[in-house]
């Protein structure tokens, strides 16, 4: 089973209003069942939202970054913090909310074409002296913005779903985010029982495709709550 996720190695499905309604395209991803932060409450609500410990920005949600909760606080104690909106102060790109990046210490809109080249190092994995490429990772010293007009194919590294081609979403896979296929009819999905639930996992699934919703598979109605299988079904 995948209940072996330990020590803040997984992304969260953020509760509304931070991440859209769970299981809806607004949230981009659907948590794999049973993959939870140890000791966490599978059905937490936003009211008792627990700080999520982290070591790297990549371990936080797309609308979060990893930092000490207090200015000048203990660097050893870091949690996922809400991203900074436009015109807020920042120290790195990950601090700024999707659609923005950090320029001269301020979060600014990333509409400009030159933005992507500036954050190349944050989304590609350096190979040192190894010039091979593997699954969308590549070593580059420069990165033309043109690359980002071409949407990522399945397996390409991404920051968010808008980086991916049609029919794909940006989802966590181990400790990277890559473009994965939006779920089709009959495919296994994850339905959170409450909008505020936190599924913490490193194998995220996309949401169900258009015209589909994540529902209990008919022949699983009699099964126990924990083993209920959800699949993408026609509305």
């Amino acid at each position: 089973t995948l209940n072996s996720v330990l020590n803040s190695n997984a992304i969260k499905n953020l509760p509304p209003p931070l991440g859209g309604a769970a299981g809806h395209p607004g949230s981009a991803v659907s948590a794999a069942p049973g993959i939870l932060y140890p000791g966490g409450n599978k059905y937490q609500t936003i009211d008792n939202y627990q700080p999520y410990p982290c070591a790297e920005d990549e371990e936080c949600g797309t609308d979060e970054y990893c930092a000490s909760p207090t200015r000048g606080g203990d660097a050893g104690v870091q949690i996922c913090l809400a991203c900074r909106k436009r015109r807020k102060r920042c120290m790195r790109h990950a601090m700024c909310c999707p659609g923005n990046y950090c320029k001269n210490g301020i979060c600014v809109s990333s509409d400009q074409n030159h933005f992507r080249g500036e954050i190349e190092e944050t989304i590609t994995e350096s190979f040192g002296n190894d010039h091979s490429t593997l699954d969308g990772y590549s070593r580059r010293t420069t990165l033309s913005s043109k690359m980002y007009h071409t949407k990522g194919q399945e397996g390409s590294v991404c920051l968010r779903s808008s980086d991916c081609a049609s029919g794909l979403c940006c989802a966590r896979h181990f400790w990277s985010k890559i473009c994965k296929p939006v779920l089709k009819e009959g495919q296994v999905c994850t339905k959170h029982r409450r909008k505020g639930s936190h599924g913490l996992e490193i194998f995220q699934r996309c949401y169900c495709g258009e015209g589909l919703s994540c529902r209990i598979q008919k022949d699983h109605h009699q099964a126990s709550n924990s083993s209920r299988l959800h699949t993408c079904q026609r509305h």
């Epitope: 190695n9 997984a10 990549e58 990893c66 994995e125 699954d135 896979h173 990277s176 890559i178 495919q187």
Partner: antibody
Amino acid sequence: EVQLLESGGGLVQPGGSLRLSCAASGFTFRTSAMSWVRQAPGKGLEWVSAISSGGGGTYYADSVKGRFTISRDNSKNTLYLQMNSLRAEDTAVYYCARGPRGRGAFDVWGQGTLVTVSS
Amino acid sequence: DIQMTQSPSSLSASVGDRVTITCRASQSISTYLHWYQQKPGKAPKLLIYAASTLHSGVPSRFSGSGSGTDFTLTISSLQPEDFATYYCQQSYNSITFGGGTKVEIK
């Protein structure tokens, strides 16, 4: 040259402990997720554990959960596997591997170090 | 966990033969499937990742195909250095390897 070099294997009694090390060179270790994969004598490959690039995320196979601990020291370009409460079935060659990368492949492997658990 | 079943478990072939090894997943794994070659006493080597992409430095006689549950590794013309054991590995959900296919000299 991209290289991984394991060390620390040997003979240990059941219930004993051992710490494996993997020295990395030729690539940017601090940006790479790393794993341990083992192979029992005459058997197939079994993935054991993985750790994220910064060390904040760790992940284990059910067979070793609670007994093994993966860690890394990016300043030393070294990966570790602390193995406690060893059992006879843990006897294997332990490989250090770079990955999972991208969709989850392991693209660089060490030569392996043999761990024998026997009384 | 997702089970990976390789077939055959072993095969005998001659230099120049076309060799096909199959790998079947217990559930759909999209293209999160990778192939490795291992020679006795040596570490595995990545041949193909993401079902069909040839890893750098791997000869073009190796190819991979498939998606979902059924995958194939093909060696178009077997060379003396290709006699080895081949493993598939899925990473769609956790990480599991197939049991291996030993390619021996006929």
